[in-house]
C-alpha cells in the first residue's frame, strides 16, 4: 500500500531567512514541509495539524504550540490551538491563518504539517451468502465463533445503539469530534443522523445480519449528520482509541474506519502507529472508481484495506462512480445491497450500498479469527485474510486496464473453520508504486515489519528495465525495481511471508563473463533457495543470446542472463524445504504460467531468460506469472522463447506444531 | 450490579390513568431500550411494548394502540409507562424488563383497577 | 403475530427427575428464543437466552436446544428449588410473545 510516494501537494517551504525572535532553527538545517489535500473541495484551509519530531514529549509539544501562539501574536495574528496530541502521534492542531505557516515551519521540533481536510462516509443507501463458506447455509448462518473476544470500534456517524439488531452489544463512547453541518436550512433529523453507523454496526455484529454475532462493539462520533468528518477528527478519534488501550488492556481491538478521504500523510502516520501498537485497523477502499492510494486511510500500508463486490463478484458501481481499486486494496467484500439495521425504527432494516459496508464484513471476520485465535499479529490475519479469500472470481474488465495487474482478485471469506490454520506457509504480493519514468527511476516494494521478503521481481508495461534487487533497509529487506532509459516506469513486487524463525539473507552474483551466464546459489548449510532476482546496467540485454537453461540437478541455484547480475534470496527456518518448478513455452507467447501444488506455497517468481522482452514477472495467488511483449511484434524466433520459474517452498516445521497443538 | 426498580403498587378506578415508572442502573441505558410486559392474575405473560432511551422512540402490541404511551428520561434513566382509560381486565402485575431480548426484569408493580 | 404453543401445561416430577418442556413456533424464529423461570409472586428470571445459552449464574442443569421452529428446555436433574412455572419467548419479531407456560409440580 501506499508508502512514501503519495499523490497529493506536498508545499515545501524552503525557509531560509531568519524569522526575528526565533530562538531555536530547526535541526540539522532540515526544513519542515507543508502538506494539503490534492482535491480542492475538501480541503479545509484555517486549520492545521503541526506534527513534531517522534521522540518530542508531550510538554515540548504544548511548549511549541505557545511559542507560535506568542510569535504569531507578535504579528498581529489570533491563533487558538483546539488540541495537543500525545499517545499516538505528539504534535497540535491549531486554527490560524495561513499566513502563519512560514512561521509554523521553522519551529522547533516540527517534522510536518498538514492542513485540514475532510473524510467522508463512504455508503450509498446476499452479503453472508458470500463469505460463508459452502459448510453453513447463509439463511442458517451461526459462525462457529461469533467474535466474543473481541472488540470491534467503529469510527463513523452517531447510532442508535438500542436497535433490536444491535441492543447491548455496542457501547457508545463520550468521543465525538464532528465538524458542523453544510448549509443554513439542514435539518438534524436523529435517525438521518444515525443511518450508517447504525447499518455498519449491524453488519459487523448484528444479531440476525451481522457476521460476527458475538463481537462487542464501542462507537465513536467522527462523522455528522452528513457523513462528514474531519482529518483531524479522525486523529483524535485515534489517539482515544490509543489511551483507552493503555488505560484498560482488553482483548484484541479491531479499528473500522468506514470513511475516506483526501491521501493524507499525518492520518496515515496515525494509522501506522496504532497498527504497531498491536490494534488491527480496517477502512474502506472508497467509493471514487479510483486508486486507492489517493485516499485516506485507504492508503495506508499498515491497514486492511477493502473494495466492494456485489452478489456476483463484481465490483460495485455507484451510481457513476464505484469502488476504488489497485494496489492499496487488499482483498473485496461484499458491498452492494447489503441488509442490516436501520436507524428509521428499532426493529427497521435497510440495504446500502459501498465499500463501508464491505469494510465492516472483514471487520467482522477478523472479530472472528481473532476470537478464535487471539495471539494473531495484523501480518498473520492480513495473510489469513488473503489466503481464505476466494480468489480470481472478479471480473477485471470494469477495472482501467493498467490497474488490472496491481488489483488484487480476492474477495473476502470465513475460513472454513476458524482453527488449524497454522501449519500453512502464508505469502502474499506486495506491489510497489509506480516508478515514474526518468532513466534512474526505481521503484521500492516492502513488506510489513513481521514478514519476511522471500523474493522480488518487476514488472514494466513498455518492457524497459533493468530488473530488480533485494536490498537491506534500515535492517530490512526490500524489493527496488530499475526503469531503464526509454521506459515508462517500473513496478518492484514482493512476495512477502510468515516464516517464524527465519534467517535469511541475499547471495549476489556478479554479470558472467562466459557466455554460459550468470549463476549464483546458497551455498550456506541448511539455506534453501526462496527467489530469484536479476538486475542489469545495460539498457538492453542482449535479446539474441539463447535462452539460459538450469542445469539438471541444481535446484538451489538461480540462473540468469551473462550481462546480469543475479540475487539468490536463502533462508534458513525450521523445516523450510523448496523446490523450483519451471514451465518453458518454445513459441513466443504474451502470458506463460506456472503453479505451485497443493500444499506448496509460491515464494519466488521469475523468467528465464531476462531479456529485453519479457515484460517482467509476479505472483498472483500461488501461480508465477511472467508476462512478455505483444506475440506479434517479438516474431518466433528463439528469444519468443519464455520461462516462467516458480520456488514453491513449505514449512514442516508449522506443519508439526499445527499437528501437535490438535 | 443492573437493576430495574420499578413504582410502588397502584389502585386505581375505571376510566383513570396510571403511571408506572422504571429506574434502571448498573449499565449505559442508551444501549438498550425498555420492554414493558404484564401479567393478569393467574394468567401468562403479555408484551405490552417497548420504548429507547437513546432517542425516545416507541414501538406497541396492536392492542394497547391508543390507550398507553411508554416514554423515557434519560437524565435520570427512567422509563415510564402510562395506561389510560383503565378497565377492569387492565388489572395486572406490571414489569419492566431490559430490551426487547427481556434479560433483567423489574420486581413488578401491580395495578388494581377497581371501582 | 408468531403463535407461541409450549407443552405440556403441567406436569408432575420428582427431585432428581430429568424434565424436557417443548415449545413450537408457529414460524421459523431462527434461534431467538429464551426461557424464563417465574415463581410465584416474582418478576421472571432468565434461564437460557437464544436458544442454548445460559446467562452467568444459571445453573448447569439448565439446558436448552432448538432452531427454527421447534424447542426445548432440559432440566437434567430437578431441585427443589426448581418447582416454578416455564415460559418460552421469541423476540425474533415483534410483538415479542410468550408461550402459555408449564407449571411444574412435585410429585
Known amino acids: 500500500q501506499e508508502d512514501e510516494d503519495g499523490d497529493y501537494e506536498e508545499l515545501v517551504l524552503a525557509l531560509r531567512s531568519e524569522e526575528d525572535g526565533l530562538a531555536e532553527a530547526p535541526e540539522h538545517g532540515t526544513t519542515a514541509t507543508f502538506h494539503r489535500c490534492a482535491k480542492d473541495p475538501w480541503r479545509l484551509p484555517g486549520t492545521y495539524v503541526v506534527v513534531l519530531k517522534e521522540e518530542t514529549h508531550l510538554s515540548q509539544s504544548e511548549r511549541t504550540a505557545r511559542r507560535l501562539q506568542a510569535q504569531a501574536a507578535r504579528r498581529g495574528y489570533l491563533t487558538k490551538i483546539l488540541h495537543v496530541f500525545h499517545g499516538l502521534l505528539p504534535g497540535f492542531l491549531v486554527k490560524m491563518s495561513g499566513d502563519l505557516l512560514e512561521l509554523a515551519l521553522k519551529l522547533p521540533h516540527v517534522d510536518y504539517i498538514e492542513e485540514d481536510s475532510s473524510v467522508f462516509a463512504q455508503s450509498i443507501p446476499w452479503n453472508l451468502e458470500r463469505i460463508t463458506p459452502p459448510r453453513y447455509r447463509a439463511d442458517e448462518y451461526q459462525p462457529p465463533d461469533g467474535g466474543s473476544l473481541v472488540e470491534v470500534y467503529l469510527l463513523d456517524t452517531s447510532i442508535q445503539s438500542d436497535h433490536r439488531e444491535i441492543e447491548g452489544r455496542v457501547m457508545v463512547t463520550d468521543f465525538e469530534n464532528v465538524p458542523e453541518e453544510d448549509g443554513t436550512r439542514f435539518h438534524r433529523q436523529a435517525s438521518k443522523c444515525d443511518s450508517h453507523g447504525t447499518h455498519l454496526a449491524g453488519v459487523v455484529s448484528g444479531r440476525d445480519a451481522g457476521v460476527a454475532k458475538g463481537a462487542s462493539m464501542r462507537s465513536l462520533r467522527v462523522l455528522n449528520c452528513q457523513g462528514k468528518g474531519t482529518v483531524s477528527g479522525t486523529l483524535i478519534g485515534l489517539e482515544f482509541i490509543r489511551k483507552s488501550q493503555l488505560v484498560q488492556p482488553v482483548g484484541p481491538l479491531v479499528v473500522l474506519l468506514p470513511l475516506a478521504g483526501g491521501y493524507s500523510r499525518v492520518l496515515n502516520a496515525a494509522c501506522q502507529r496504532l497498527a504497531r501498537a498491536g490494534v488491527v485497523l480496517v477502512t474502506a477502499a472508497g467509493n471514487f472508481r479510483d486508486d486507492a492510494c489517493l485516499y485516506s486511510p485507504a492508503s495506508a500500508p499498515e491497514v486492511i484495506t477493502v473494495g466492494a463486490t456485489n452478489a456476483q463478484d463484481q465490483p460495485v458501481t455507484l451510481g457513476t462512480l464505484g469502488t476504488n481499486f489497485g494496489r492499496c486494496v487488499d482483498l473485496f467484500a461484499p458491498g452492494e445491497d447489503i441488509i442490516g439495521a436501520s436507524s428509521d425504527c428499532s426493529t427497521c432494516f435497510v440495504s446500502q450500498s459501498g465499500t463501508s459496508q464491505a469494510a465492516a464484513h472483514v471487520a467482522g471476520i477478523a472479530a472472528m479469527m481473532l476470537s478464535a485465535e487471539p495471539e494473531l499479529t495484523l501480518a498473520e490475519l492480513r495473510q489469513r485474510l488473503i489466503h481464505f479469500s476466494a480468489k480470481d472470481v472478479i471480473n477485471e474488465a470494469w477495472f482501467p486496464e493498467d490497474q488490472r495487474v496491481l488489483t488484487p482478485n480476492l474477495v473476502a471469506a470465513l475460513p472454513p473453520s476458524t482453527h488449524g490454520a497454522g501449519w500453512q506457509l502464508f505469502c502474499r504480493t506486495v506491489w510497489s508504486a509506480h516508478s515514474g519514468p526518468t532513466r534512474m527511476a526505481t521503484a521500492v516494494a516492502r513488506c510489513a515489519p513481521d514478514e519476511e521478503l522471500l523474493s522480488c521481481s518487476s514488472f514494466s508495461r513498455s518492457g524497459k528495465r533493468r530488473g530488480e534487487r533485494m536490498e537491506a533497509q534500515g535492517g530490512k529487506l526490500v524489493c527496488r525495481a530499475h526503469n531503464a532509459f526509454g521506459g515508462e516506469g517500473v513496478y518492484a513486487i514482493a512476495r512477502c511471508c510468515l516464516l517464524p524463525q527465519a534467517n535469511c539473507s541475499v547471495h549476489t552474483a556478479p554479470p558472467a563473463e562466459a557466455s554460459m551466464g550468470t549463476r549464483v546459489h546458497c551455498h550456506q548449510q541448511g539455506h534453501v533457495l526462496t527467489g530469484c532476482s536479476s538486475h542489469w546496467e545495460v539498457e538492453d540485454l542482449g535479446t539474441h543470446k539463447p535462452p539460459v537453461l538450469r542445469p539438471r540437478g541444481q535446484p538451489n541455484q538461480c540462473v540468469g542472463h551473462r550481462e546480469a547480475s543475479i540475487h539468490a534470496s536463502c533462508c534458513h527456518a525450521p523445516g523450510l524445504e523448496c523446490k523450483v518448478k519451471e514451465h518453458g513455452i518454445p513459441a513466443p507467447q504474451e502470458q506463460v504460467t506456472v503453479a505451485c501444488e497443493e500444499g506448496w506455497t509460491l515464494t519466488g517468481c521469475s523468467a528465464l531468460p531476462g531479456t529485453s522482452h519479457v515484460l517482467g514477472a509476479y505472483a498472483v495467488d500461488n501461480t508465477c506469472v511472467v508476462r512478455s511483449r505483444d506475440v506479434s511484434t517479438t516474431g518466433s524466433t528463439s528469444e519468443g522463447a519464455v520461462t516462467a520459474v516458480a520456488i514453491c517452498c513449505r514449512s514442516r516445521h508449522l506443519a508439526q506444531a499445527s499437528q501437535e497443538l490438535q | 450490579q443492573v437493576q430495574l426498580v420499578q413504582s410502588g403498587a397502584e389502585v386505581k378506578k375505571p376510566g383513570a390513568s396510571v403511571k408506572v415508572s422504571c429506574k434502571a442502573s448498573g449499565y449505559t441505558v442508551t444501549s438498550y431500550g425498555i420492554s414493558w410486559v404484564r401479567q393478569a392474575p393467574g394468567q401468562g405473560l403479555e408484551w405490552m411494548g417497548w420504548?429507547?432511551?437513546?432517542?425516545?422512540?416507541?414501538n406497541y402490541a396492536q392492542k394497547l394502540q391508543g390507550r398507553g404511551t411508554m416514554t423515557t428520561d434519560p437524565s435520570t434513566s427512567t422509563a415510564y409507562m402510562e395506561l389510560r382509560s383503565l378497565r377492569s381486565d387492565d388489572t395486572a402485575v406490571y414489569y419492566c424488563?431490559?430490551?426487547?431480548?427481556?434479560?433483567?426484569w423489574g420486581q413488578g408493580t401491580t395495578v388494581t383497577v377497581s371501582s | 403475530d408468531i403463535q407461541m404453543t409450549q407443552s405440556p401445561s403441567s406436569l408432575s416430577a420428582s427431585v432428581g427427575d430429568r424434565v424436557t418442556i417443548t415449545c413450537r413456533a408457529s414460524q421459523n424464529i431462527n434461534n431467538w428464543l429464551n426461557w424464563y423461570q417465574q415463581k410465584p409472586g416474582k418478576a421472571p428470571k432468565l434461564l437460557i437466552y437464544?436458544?442454548?445459552t445460559r446467562p452467568t449464574g444459571v445453573p448447569s442443569r439448565f439446558s436448552g436446544s432448538g432452531s427454527g421452529t421447534d424447542f426445548t428446555l432440559t432440566i437434567s436433574s430437578l431441585q427443589p428449588e426448581d418447582f416454578a412455572t416455564y415460559y418460552c419467548?421469541?423476540?425474533?419479531?415483534?410483538?415479542?410473545?410468550f408461550g402459555q407456560g408449564t407449571k411444574v409440580e412435585i410429585k
Open positions: 419467548q421469541q423476540w425474533d419479531d415483534t410483538p415479542n410473545t
Open positions: 420504548v429507547s432511551f437513546y432517542n425516545g422512540n416507541s
Open positions: 437464544g436458544a442454548s
Open positions: 424488563a431490559r430490551g426487547y431480548s427481556l434479560d433483567v
